[in-house]
């Protein structure tokens, strides 16, 4: 129902703590360069204003839309043009154009330093001094680096962070308690970020229909006992929640997500037998738990898919009557039978089915034409299955670091024009798929691998969009979202690329590398590997292995030497010469 004051309504629904957290996230995602203190001041002002509206909904300005209220706040920031350049032009527009303008200026790769974690003692001290401010900093730092992070989920991760600090700061050895736990949260949060960005890309580029199709497939896999009407209702609600979050309407998004969680818990009987443990949890944990709940047991008596979608006389009539509903039921029926497929694959199959009906239903004898459609799915299914097998075998043989290097070589050959930092980031992320997915049971590998790769490749596309340099990448990124991963997999060495000339300084290292954390050392070595491939795109795996082994040996020797600087300055040039010879 309509509320006199939208801001009062949301404040009442969400409560002060979540309200403030969400407003902070919203501001941090819009204005990514502002300091925590600047945003905290704005959040306090907005919260105080919300309270006046709660007290009297008829008070001045309380009837204004949230976009108007938040936009006015952001536009009142001093030095907006100096700090944000043309984003300041958004402030000359009226709503809803102003908000659209803010959204278009969100930067997926802001030039901010990496979020460094303070050492344990310092963290615990500032956490104990002021837990609210500490968590505010966390929300601000994550939100500004990830401008599409799913806001209610970020509140959940902040809560996790809080619980870990509360527990570990009471321990004698804070460091060994905090590090693995916070690393775990960080890893999950980063995956959550790329997944949500993929959802927003789907929504932005292809609209609500595309996202809803994704949701129908995903929900049907998870809740195979729910009927089509129930799945459609959940998909519609989930689409609304995601549309709001992707559109910057974070208060509405969090409120509607809480409503959806409530609905699911009140209707477990018609949705799934696996929800009870989630439903016993408090709000943030409940919604998070529901979002990754295990698949319900598939009904035993499901008829073959062919009955309704190939053998039925009425196929074309049913398709003509309501195309979207008929295709939706196909996607639902196929997905609930295949929790072992990725959502991307299921959407490709639905697309193939749609194309077949479009072609066949226009013919004089449609059944003869679409009768083989399920057999035609086979190559579409085999391709990702082979991808999983090949890559998991390689991961098991090489381990995560070696697997990342193999991917780095492969992708540098596919798109050598892409900047080395982007290639290294992409390869490291793509390489993590091994650790994340290849250790899972067989029937869970394909959905894990393909849907994760799709999300990572979406980030590659977003970064490439800013500065397009590779025709290969542009080609794969301009197609539909579900075709991206197969497109990238099919790319081969870019024959149009003119190899980079060999620059000795690119492969010159100094003793400071010895004191770097292992992750940073790996990145340095992977940067060198990408540069080698750019210099010799057709180098064999054997040649590259020889060079990288030599490089690793060089680092090991010099980092153990008594006089590291001398070792690096004398052995370095020799290494460069050997590299050139090995690749000649």
């Amino acid at each position: 129902e309509a509320h006199k004051s939208e801001i009062a309504h949301r404040y009442n629904d969400l409560g002060e703590q979540h309200f403030k957290g969400l407003v902070l996230i919203a501001f941090s995602q819009y204005l990514q360069k502002c300091s925590y203190d600047e945003h905290a001041k704005l959040v306090q002002e907005v919260t105080d204003f919300a309270k006046t509206c709660v007290a009297d909904e008829s008070a001045a300005n309380c009837d204004k839309s949230l976009h108007t209220l938040f936009g006015d706040k952001l536009c009142a920031i001093p030095n907006l043009r100096e700090n944000y350049g043309e984003l300041a032009d958004c402030c000359t527009k009226q709503e809803p154009e102003r908000n659209e303008c803010f959204l278009q200026h969100k930067d997926d790769n802001p030039s901010l330093p990496p979020f460094e974690r303070p050492e344990a003692e310092a963290m615990c001290t500032s956490f104990k001094e002021n837990p609210t401010t500490f968590m505010g900093h966390y929300l601000h730092e994550v939100a500004r680096r990830h401008p599409y992070f799913y806001a209610p989920e970020l509140l959940y991760y902040a809560e996790q962070y809080n619980e870990i600090l509360t527990q570990c700061c009471a321990e004698a050895d804070k460091e060994s308690c905090l590090t693995p736990k916070l690393d775990g949260v960080k890893e999950k949060a980063l995956v959550s970020s790329v997944r949500q960005r993929m959802k927003c890309s789907s929504m932005q580029k292809f609209g609500e229909r595309a996202f809803k199709a994704w949701a129908v497939a995903r929900l049907s896999q998870t809740f195979p006992n729910a009927d089509f009407a129930e799945i459609t209702k959940l998909a519609t609600d989930l689409t609304k929640v995601n549309k709001e979050c992707c559109h910057g309407d974070l208060l509405e998004c969090a409120d509607d997500r809480a409503e959806l969680a409530k609905y699911m818990c009140e209707n477990q009987a018609t949705i799934s037998s696996k929800l009870q443990t989630c439903c016993d949890k408090p709000l943030l944990k409940k919604a998070h738990c529901l979002s990754e709940v295990e698949h319900d047991t598939m009904p035993a008596d499901l008829p073959a898919i062919a009955a309704d979608f190939v053998e039925d006389q009425e196929v074309c009539k049913n398709y003509a009557e309501a195309k979207d509903v008929f295709l939706g039921t196909f996607l639902y029926e196929y997905s609930r039978r295949h929790p072992d497929y990725s959502v991307s694959l299921l959407l490709r199959l639905a697309k193939k089915y749609e194309a077949t009906l479009e072609k066949c239903c226009a013919e004089a004898n449609p059944p003869a034409c679409y009768g083989t459609v399920l057999a035609e799915f086979q190559p579409l299914v085999e391709e990702p299955k082979n991808l999983v097998k090949t890559n998991c075998d390689l991961y098991e043989k090489l381990g995560e670091y070696g697997f990342q290097n193999a991917i780095l070589v492969r992708y540098t050959q596919k798109a050598p024009q892409v900047s080395t930092p982007t290639l290294v980031e992409a390869a490291r992320n793509l390489g993590r798929v091994g650790t994340k997915c290849c250790t899972l049971p067989e029937d869970q590998r394909l959905p894990c691998v393909e849907d994760y790769l799709s999300a990572i490749l979406n980030r590659v596309c977003l970064l490439h969009e800013k500065t397009p340099v590779s025709e290969h990448v542009t080609k794969c990124c301009s197609g539909s979202l579900v075709e991206r991963r197969p497109c990238f997999s099919a790319l081969t060495v870019d024959e149009t690329y003119v190899p980079k000339e060999f620059k000795a300084e690119t492969f010159t290292f100094h003793s400071d590398i010895c004191t770097l954390p292992e992750k940073e050392k790996q990145i340095k070595k992977q940067t060198a590997l990408a540069e080698l491939v750019k210099h010799k795109p057709k180098a064999t795996a054997e040649q590259l292995k020889t060079v990288m082994d030599d490089f690793a040996q060089f680092l090991d020797t010099c980092c153990k030497a008594a006089d590291k600087d001398t070792c690096f300055s004398t052995e370095g040039p020799n290494l460069v010469t050997r590299c050139k010879d090995a690749l000649a």
Epitope: Q313, E314, C316, A362, P366, P367, A368
Partner: nanobody, 115 residues
Framework: QVQLVESGGGLVQPGGSLRLSCAAS????????MSWVRQAPGKGPEWVSA????????RYAESVKGRFTISRDNAKKTLYLQMNSLKPEDTAVYYC????????GSQGTQVTVSS
């Protein structure tokens, strides 16, 4: 909502002619192949003829080949069946269907061939 409305049936003497029409609405008519199906009293449905969405490809049951002609006007969203040299065994309710369906989703139009 898909609607198919047949017309043009009637009583005709053996050897006579009739032209049946089927007015379609509620779907993209030109994207779908269409069929004529008939059902004689006490019998199951029998497929008569089919035409593709563009009107180029036509097919006929052996029993009507050379006597019946199927056509369509996509601008008018109408399907036709020109029936010549009618025989008593052509007596049936004729109805049009979408795609390869033979099940009846409309009223149909009665064709009676009798002297």
């Amino acid at each position: 909502q898909v609607q198919l409305v047949e017309s043009g049936g009637g009583l005709v003497q053996p050897g006579g002619s009739l032209r049946l029409s089927c007015a379609a609405s509620g779907f993209t008519f030109g994207s779908f192949g269409m069929s004529w199906v008939r059902q004689a009293p006490g019998k199951g449905p029998e497929w008569v003829s089919a035409i593709d969405g563009g009107g180029a490809d036509t097919r006929y049951a052996e029993s009507v080949k050379g006597r019946f002609t199927i056509s369509r006007d996509n601008a008018k969203k109408t399907l036709y069946l020109q029936m010549n040299s009618l025989k008593p065994e052509d007596t049936a309710v004729y109805y049009c269907t979408i795609g390869g369906s033979t099940s009846r989703g409309s009223q149909g139009t009665q064709v009676t061939v009798s002297s």
